[in-house]
């Protein structure tokens, strides 16, 4: 019997029966055995067929079978109801081999042609799969020429058996207090030959709770319990399980912080398997109860490890550990059942005493010493010789802790000294002039350091002076001694005041003219304002309307007098403001060089001469009296003048300290 | 991690001021706690001397309440204390604290000296 | 001001031994005590504080107990770096006050 062609030689081509196209001969038999590639399937058709036509083609017939299974058996020309002919049919191996059987008997009626066939091998497409049949690959088929492989979605691995996709299923670990966890795919059917593994891992205090969910489908057996798939779920102390079947299992309190659920699958069934509700619990904590004035939040029916609540004071109110300041509380439940703080207090808001105000007084308004939330308190200032500078005084406990103003400061206000004032009436009659009486110059500063010159009291820690007065001190500022309160230059009877720094205008040049001859002390200390020591006030704007020519301003000082003298009493003069033109042209002509008098400066005096200010009266304050306000004002500082004091035709020339207001401000708001 | 760190002179003659500073890292003197100057007295009597809280409020000891004085930097995150007219009685140790006493700098020592 | 009194300036104990460490306040302070340890050149260290409550990183031997006015701090199982000087400390009343120490010495 011909075996026809074999793999690995080229697989195609023709087979007859013998004698073809001629007849064929009676008791013949033929068989061809055809093999194709691993992979591949044989496909063949005829080109003619003529047998004899018989009952089940019992006589003569041409037989196709591949393995054990027969394909066809063929005969006459055409099929009738329990014959086959070919026809235009292409038939196929099951495998890669084909057998063909070719047989006549010991007679035919009439001549028949027998047969022409051509075969070939092809490619079988394993992929393709007949409805009814398991597919070839759990998840994608991948055909190829002479064979196939399968793959897998992610999340799957293909097991050995190259076709099934087992899930990558083990490692996942939960760290939440609760979850779901269910079988790859749930709802839809798991897979086959996987093997998964799930931890719960809570932190130790926790114990896990698990609920079956839903529905639960796992394939199961009659009589052996669990075979083929099972679910188990371990702890540190018992071992639950296996479970499978369709009945939901029970809750599982597992009393215990780690759980471990294995799934493990074989290679059959169709089921869909669990999903699992974990959930956790723990020793509560003893319910919180909020202190007085005080709440708990969030509120929960209970509280568990991990959870946690914080304490809000109501306004007004501060949470405090015993004496010590919390600005937050929360406090977080332990394993024990124990919270890891100790509930605090809410306690009314305490302000403390408040500060003592320098030159002034503070009075309790709601109650003897009640500092606590909306106390109110009410500051003021020494009368007569202080006045409180921006605020009224009026202060409230606020829930911060401090006492705050109506315009919401919490400094303390400040008690400015009255400026400007006198015992002294105007007009009436230093050189020419009249002694002071007490409280007529309180503003008046003996400044003695090398020479003696005088000063005007600024606020109750500045000087103001003529810059060639202190300019041999200027680094050696506490070598000036600084006296006030006395009307007598040589008295033990004064106060004393100390010098912090000098600062003299950096326009003046020392030696070389007096533009700019002004000068400022800072005391070291601030000084007590009674009606012996007040301070001048600086020029308003207005001012210059009470400093015109003519206007009479008052000088004092303990300079030379008219007996050549330094005077032991406390002198004044009022004398007239003089016309600028009048006093340049006057200090124009030899020994005097050009541009002595400048727009910086004022002159005061009579053309007659005899009111002066002289040698010893430097830095000291030419005062003018707004009427306006009835204060006193500094309009000149005492700075030069002719040889002669109160010579006729000459002025005492004075720095006009209007000119000089945004440097005395910018030096007492930065010093 | 929260640390806090006493600096300060040393060496201070009688009727001077002493200053000292605690500078904090790891946490912000303005977000919680009282901020503490505690010292320690040779003999290792301790005694607490005031403090400044979150807020800015002070709290002082009353047998120092007229020479201290407790402030703040909040921009440096440091806060000072200053105690005037010293005597050789105020040589101590000088710890800074945050309360609840959770945190101490190392102390610095301070000597009141002629 | 209130005074913490620790009447044993000194206390003898061996390792291994249970050792209590008693103050008394002379007036109620709550729960609002605190006990420190402090080793020669070193700064206090917070052990307890709201009389029972241990600083985290505090061993669980250290144990504080007690309300109001008396208040123990007891360490289970001495170790040798237990020898030191304890300190109580109530923050409850204004101005905060400390007791004068305990110094915990080996037999």
């Known amino acids: 019997t011909p075996l026809g062609p074999k793999w690995p030689e080229p697989v195609f081509g023709r087979l007859a029966s013998p004698g073809f196209p001629g007849e064929y001969a009676n008791d013949q038999e033929r068989r061809w055995t055809l093999t194709a590639p691993p992979g591949y399937r044989l496909r063949l058709y005829f080109t003619h067929f003529d047998l004899e036509l018989s009952h089940l083609c019992e006589y003569d017939f041409v037989k196709l079978s591949s393995g054990a299974k027969v394909l066809a058996t063929l005969c006459g020309q055409e099929s009738t109801d329990t014959e086959r002919a070919p026809g235009k049919d292409t038939f196929y191996s099951l495998g890669s081999s084909l057998d063909i059987t070719f047989r006549s008997d010991y007679s035919n009626e009439k001549p028949f042609t027998g047969f022409e066939a051509f075969y070939a091998a092809e490619d079988i497409d394993e992929c393709q799969v007949a409805p009814g049949e398991a597919p070839t690959c759990d998840h994608h088929c991948h055909n190829h020429l002479g064979g196939f492989y399968c793959s897998c979605r992610a999340g799957y691995v293909l097991h050995r058996n190259k076709r099934t996709c087992s899930a990558l299923c083990s490692g996942q670990v939960f760290t939440q207090r609760s979850g779901e966890l269910s079988s790859p795919e749930y709802p839809r059917p798991y897979p086959k030959l996987s093997s998964c593994t799930y931890s719960i891992s809570l932190e130790e205090g926790f114990s896990v709770i698990l609920d079956f969910v839903e529905s639960f489908d796992v394939e199961t057996h009659p009589e052996t319990l669990c075979p083929y798939d099972f679910l188990k779920i371990q702890t540190d102390r018992e071992e639950h399980g296996p479970f499978c079947g369709k009945t939901l299992p029970h809750r599982i309190e597992t009393k215990s912080n780690t759980v471990t659920i294995t799934f493990v699958t074989d290679e059959s069934g169709d089921h869909t398997g669990w999903k699992i509700h974990y959930t956790s619990t723990a020793q509560p904590c003893p319910y919180p109860m909020a202190p007085p004035n005080g709440h708990v939040s969030p509120v929960q029916a209970k509280y568990i490890l991990k959870d946690s609540f914080s304490i809000f004071c109501e306004t007004g109110y501060e949470l405090l550990q015993g004496h010590l300041p919390l600005k937050s509380f929360t406090a977080v439940c332990q394993k024990d059942g124990s919270w890891d703080r100790p509930m605090p207090a809410c306690s009314i808001v305490d302000c403390g005493p408040p500060d003592d105000l320098p030159s002034g007084r503070v009075e309790y308004i709601t109650g003897p010493g009640v500092t606590t939330y909306k106390a109110v308190i009410q500051y003021s200032c020494e009368e007569t010789f202080y006045t409180m500078k921006v605020n009224d005084g009026k202060y409230v406990c606020e829930a911060d802790g401090f006492w705050t103003s109506s315009k919401g400061e919490k400094s303390l206000p400040v008690c400015e000294p009255v400026c400007g004032l006198s015992a002294r009436t105007t007009g009436g009659r230093i050189y020419g002039g009249q002694k002071a009486k007490p409280g007529d110059f309180p503003w008046q500063v003996l400044i003695l350091g090398g020479t003696t010159a005088a000063g005007a009291l600024l606020y109750d820690n500045w000087v103001l002076t003529a810059a060639h007065a202190v300019y041999e001190q200027k680094h050696d500022a506490s070598a000036l001694d600084i006296r006030m309160g006395t009307l007598k230059r040589l008295s033990p009877h004064y106060t004393q005041a100390w010098s912090e720094a000098v600062f003299i205008h950096e326009g003046y040049t020392h030696d070389a003219g007096f533009d700019n001859d002004i000068a400022l002390i800072k005391l070291n200390n601030k000084v007590v304002i009674n009606s012996n020591i007040t301070p001048i006030c600086l020029p308003r704007k207005e001012a210059e309307s009470f400093m015109r020519t003519d206007d009479i301003g008052t000088a004092s000082g303990w300079g030379l007098t008219q007996r050549g003298f330094l005077a032991r009493n406390l002198m004044y003069v009022d004398i007239p403001i003089v016309d600028h033109q009048k006093c340049t042209a006057a200090y124009e002509k030899p020994p005097y060089p050009r541009g002595s008098v400048t727009a910086n400066m004022l002159c005061a005096g009579l053309e007659s001469g005899g009111k002066d200010s002289c040698r010893g009266d430097s830095g000291g304050a030419l005062v003018f009296l707004d009427s306006e306000t009835e204060r006193w004002f500094v309009g000149g500082i005492v700075s030069w003048g002719s040889m002669n004091c109160g010579e006729a035709g000459q002025y005492g020339v004075y720095t006009k300290v209007i000119n000089y207001i945004p440097w005395i401000e910018n030096i007492i708001s930065d010093f | 991690d929260v640390q806090l760190q006493e600096s300060g002179p040393g060496l201070v003659k009688p009727s001077q001021s002493l200053s000292l500073t605690c500078t904090v890292t790891g946490y912000s003197i303005t977000s919680d706690y009282a901020w503490n100057w505690i010292r320690q007295f040779p003999g290792n009597k301790l005694e607490w001397m005031g403090y400044i809280s979150y807020s800015g409020r002070t709290s002082y000891n009353p047998s120092l309440k007229s020479r201290i004085s407790i402030t703040r930097n909040t921009s440096t995150n440091q806060f000072f204390l200053q105690l005037n007219s010293v005597t050789t009685e105020d040589t101590a140790t000088y710890f800074c604290a945050r309360y609840w006493g959770d945190y101490w700098g190392q102390g610095t020592t301070l000597t009141v000296s002629s | 001001d209130i005074v913490m009194t620790q009447s044993q300036k000194f206390m003898s104990t061996s390792v291994g031994d249970r050792v209590s460490v008693t103050c008394k306040a002379s007036?109620?302070?709550?729960?609002?005590v605190a006990w420190f340890q402090q080793k020669p050149g070193q700064s206090p260290k917070p052990l307890i504080y709201s009389a029972s409550y241990r600083y985290s990183g505090v061993p669980d031997r250290f144990t504080g107990s007690g309300s109001g006015t008396d208040f123990t701090l007891t360490i289970s199982n001495v170790q040798s770096e237990d020898l030191a000087e304890y300190f109580c400390?109530?923050?409850?009343?204004?101005?905060?006050?400390f007791g004068a120490g305990t110094k915990l010495e080996l037999n």
């Open positions: 400390h109530q923050y409850n009343t204004y101005p905060l006050t």
């Open positions: 007036q109620n302070v709550g729960s609002n």
